[in-house]
């Protein structure tokens, strides 16, 4: 059981007062982390309070600064970036948010040497992208979907692909569903070890469908936002990869890297990239059935100017039961001999594990076993192989740090993070310097976050980089709810949750109950890590009893649990939120007649399912901005887990697994309907459709729009949001204003 | 939308010359900077000449410096490329490109092929 302390102990005990929904609004409980931007083994920058950016050397115990915030001022900058070679940083200003990842920017460089602004042969604006090469200060950047070369910032560019186009040709940049459900960048391009070669990806969308939707704004007549958006089954993006020598761009100009033919013989995914030294690479390639990925390693020969992928340098990855890796399919870390790799893939008891490739995926070493999973690898070095995974006390949300030494033989394995401050934190993530001389530790809880900062060689702890003190105090008159986090074992399934307790919890009483659900696969809820949020207010100050519970088809506990709702999304995720509630509702502390559900996204999908399962739990619920139909959503998230919407593959569950099916069922709960009306992600029209469906039925059901809002619905629509849906609930629940 | 077509290209013997000629028709021509690329069979696409939305500022790479010369005349909608002294290895499609800002193109003519044999 892990038991978040309900106070800092505190005699005046009517000082403490419970937390409000102002508070989680305005952000008051929120914590900081600090994440060194490292430039060497023993340096690293980060930007002060006073927003100048500070370099501080571990080993000399100094600082000074590089930027003033007086500079940072003048061109208005958000972020920066310093070259390498620390001669120049550049400076972004004007951030405007596109999607999860993409923004664009306007871009700065400032001569550190001369302590002036770079003139002449300035950026264009806005910049896509742009990022300095590992070495010297060479630039790279997309402009108007097109790739640009600076050998240094005051040169001339070189332009490298010409074929950019909005909404067609994406050079160096990633198109939406790449983005979304690929990627997971902002970028698609990647400078080699030392800068000699540019790899970059060219995705072209001619012929994807395009999602429409119309942007309000303040105009006479809205916009329309067009969106190449590939939906389940629809024409997907074609992907080329190009590698082009920096240093004399135009001699043979970008050289294409070949598909596998296994690969290349039907749809096909390209899936990342990563360099091994500046004349190997590395590129993972995926069949648009998720099943099967191939690691291809590439060579440049010299003679005649190409990449060469042989063969023997193909390295298949398949799954039997589900798809390839988890959410992604992990990347490789190359070790010194820049052959051999370390990977995660399932082991054959169906575990994600370290495995050491040197010649053959079959002949891979094991490097770490056991029923739990390793989930990353953060760092190799000559001796030492630094991972995290959830093994520790069996916790399958906690993550603990780890060092195998791969130097000696036998490899010995140590927690670096098991017993640091063991009640405090137990979920950890790490920022290794160059050649893992220091690293910081980030502890996200269940305690008070705290970031520290380590000897790579001893372990030993250097300093607080940053314990949130400020937050402490603030906590010290709060009433905090209590938090658990337990195991219900049913028909061979073991349900981990979360269940947070009012202040004075009382077993003897009866409690309302909300579920909060995200459900998705290789997702994870019940994570032993701190908030203060929307459902702590509600069992604080409301008297609620909130539980998060992890069903089939999520992550880190094994395949059997993750690949269970291959190709049946909407099944077993539902069965398992209505199996919890049931086993809650025999602890005897839970009042049965105001039970409800919620959800967000695919969360949203869920809670919809389980509010028209019929069975009579819930009296309601809520779902925002929910997925309704799997057709509706991209193709490469969709036919991962549900192969595609023909006949002869899973047509037929993709039209059972839909909200609207079940419409009739929604008569006897009360329903809260929520979606913001410019959803590039989960778009509109999947609630569009729910609402149509239930109106058809002449089920009763309430429903809020957020006009112009995307799947985050931040900004004034968050406060209106939570406000709208606490209402909602203590209605339900009958509670007083 | 802009469109450009180039002309002036064809064969010419080595150490002769040529002038390259483009026209450019749409509306936001003159805000333009413009230049001339040239690709040769099996090489990367290299920026040959540049000029500036005024004429007040040129760009030339090494390898054509002093031999080639870049002009536009804004009233007309032209650009030309003045090419002396040519070399087998000038032996290239030439094409028209006009940007939005200094040396960043985002529009392309079709290309003149110029050929320097004896």
């Known amino acids: 059981i892990v038991l978040r302390p309900s106070r800092v102990h505190n005699s005046e005990e009517n000082t403490m007062r419970a937390l409000t929904l102002k508070d989680i609004l305005n952000g008051t409980f929120s914590y900081k982390t600090f994440f060194p931007n490292w430039i060497s083994g023993q340096e690293y920058l980060h930007q002060s309070a006073d927003n100048n950016i500070v370099l501080y050397n571990i080993e000399t115990g100094q600082s000074y600064t590089i930027l003033s915030n007086r500079t940072m001022k003048s061109v208005n900058a958000s972020n920066y970036g310093l070259s390498p070679d620390r001669q120049f940083v550049y400076l972004e200003s004007d951030y405007s948010k596109l999607w999860r990842y993409s923004y664009t920017a306007t871009y700065y460089i400032y001569d550190l040497s001369n302590g002036e602004f770079v003139r002449g042969n300035e950026l264009p604006r806005p910049i896509q992208y742009l990022c300095w090469s590992p070495v010297g200060s060479k630039l790279a950047y997309v402009y108007q979907n097109n790739i640009y070369l600076k050998q240094r910032p005051g040169d001339p560019p070189f332009q490298i692909t010409f074929n950019g186009r909005e909404n067609k040709i994406f050079n160096g940049i990633p198109d939406w569903v790449y983005e979304e459900e690929m990627l997971a960048t902002k970028y698609a391009l990647w400078w080699s070890p030392n800068g000699k070669f540019l790899a970059y990806a060219e995705f072209n969308d001619t012929d994807i469908p395009v999602i429409a939707y119309s942007y309000y704004g303040d105009e006479q007549y809205p916009r329309t936002i067009n969106i190449p958006y590939p939906k389940a089954g629809a024409k997907n993006p074609v992907v080329r990869i190009f590698i082009i020598d920096t240093t004399y761009p135009a001699y043979v100009g970008p050289q294409e890297v070949p598909v596998p033919a296994m690969i290349a013989s039907s749809d096909y995914y390209f899936s990342w990239l990563t360099w091994v030294t500046d004349e190997r690479v590395c590129l993972q390639w995926l069949k648009r059935v998720q099943n099967v990925s191939v690691l291809s390693i590439c060579d440049f020969r010299e003679d005649w100017q190409t990449w060469d992928c042989p063969k023997t340098q193909e390295h298949i990855e398949e799954s039997r039961t589900g798809w390839a890796g988890g959410f992604f399919v992990s990347t490789p870390v190359f070790s010194y001999d820049a052959i051999s790799y370390y990977k995660i893939f399932s082991d054959k008891d169906g575990y994600k594990h370290i495995h050491y490739i040197k010649d053959t995926v079959e002949n891979a070493i094991q490097i770490t076993s056991g029923k739990w999973e390793a989930i990353n690898i953060f760092r190799v070095t000559q001796d030492s192989l630094f991972y995290s995974s959830n093994e520790f006390e069996e916790y399958p949300g906690r993550r603990n740090i780890y060092r195998i030494s791969i130097g000696s033989y036998p490899p010995s394995k140590k927690c670096v993070t098991c017993h640091l401050r063991k009640e405090r934190c137990q979920y950890y993530t790490a920022s290794f310097s160059d050649y893992a001389k220091y690293y910081a530790l980030v502890c996200y809880g269940p305690g008070i976050p705290i970031s520290t900062l380590h000897d790579g060689r001893t372990d030993q702890e250097i300093k607080i980089l940053e314990e949130n003190k400020e937050l402490e105090n603030a906590l010290k008159n709060i009433q905090l709810p209590k938090e658990e986090i337990k195991k219900l074992e049913v028909d061979e399934i073991t349900l981990w949750y979360k269940m947070i307790l009012p202040p004075q919890f009382d077993r003897s009483k009866k409690y309302p109950l909300l579920i909060q659900v995200y459900g998705g696969p290789c997702s994870q809820s019940v994570r032993s890590v701190f908030a203060v949020n929307w459902i702590s207010y509600l069992a604080s100050k409301e008297g609620m009893v909130i539980a998060l519970v992890d069903g089939r088809g999520t992550a880190f506990q094994g395949d059997k649990l993750l690949y269970a709702v291959y190709r049946k999304l909407g099944v077993y995720e539902v069965e398992d939120q209505i199996t919890a509630v049931r086993k809650f509702i025999e602890m005897g502390f839970i009042d049965e007649k105001r039970i409800a559900i919620w959800g967000w996204s695919y969360g949203g999908y869920v809670s919809s399912l389980a509010l028209a399962s019929g069975t009579g739990l819930f009296k309601c619920g809520i779902a925002v901005a929910p997925v309704s139909s799997w057709e509706y959503y991209a193709s490469v998230y969709t036919e991962r887990f549900m192969g595609l919407p023909t006949k002869d593959d899973n047509l037929e569950h993709y039209k059972n697994s839909t909200v609207m099916a079940r419409a009739e069922y929604f008569r006897n709960v009360d329903y809260l309907l929520i979606h913001g009306t410019a959803d590039d992600n989960v778009h509109f029209q999947n609630s569009a459709q729910i609402a149509k469906a239930l109106v058809n039925a002449q089920v009763d059901f309430q429903a809020m729009w957020y006009s112009d809002q995307n799947h985050g619905l931040s900004g004034l629509s968050t406060n209106h949001l939570y406000t709208h849906m606490t209402h909602f609930l203590k209605q339900c629940f009958s509670l007083s204003d | 939308e802009v469109q450009l077509v180039e002309s002036g290209g064809g064969l010419v013997q080595p150490g002769g010359s040529l002038r390259l000629s483009c026209a450019a028709s749409?509306?936001?021509?003159?805000?333009?900077?413009m230049g001339w690329f040239r690709q040769a069979p099996g090489k990367g696409r290299e920026l040959v000449a540049a000029?500036?939305?005024?004429?007040?500022?040129?760009y030339y790479p090494d390898s054509v410096e002093g031999r080639f010369t870049i002009s536009r005349d804004n009233a007309k909608r032209m650009v030309y490329l003045q090419m002396n002294s040519l070399r087998a290895e000038d032996t290239a499609v030439y094409y028209c490109?006009?940007?939005?800002?200094?040396?960043?193109?985002?529009?392309w003519g079709q290309g003149t092929q110029v050929t320097v044999s004896s």
């Open positions: 490109a006009v940007g939005q800002y200094d040396w960043h193109f985002d529009y």
């Open positions: 000029i500036s939305r005024t004429g007040g500022s040129t």
């Open positions: 749409g509306s936001i021509y003159d805000l333009y900077t």
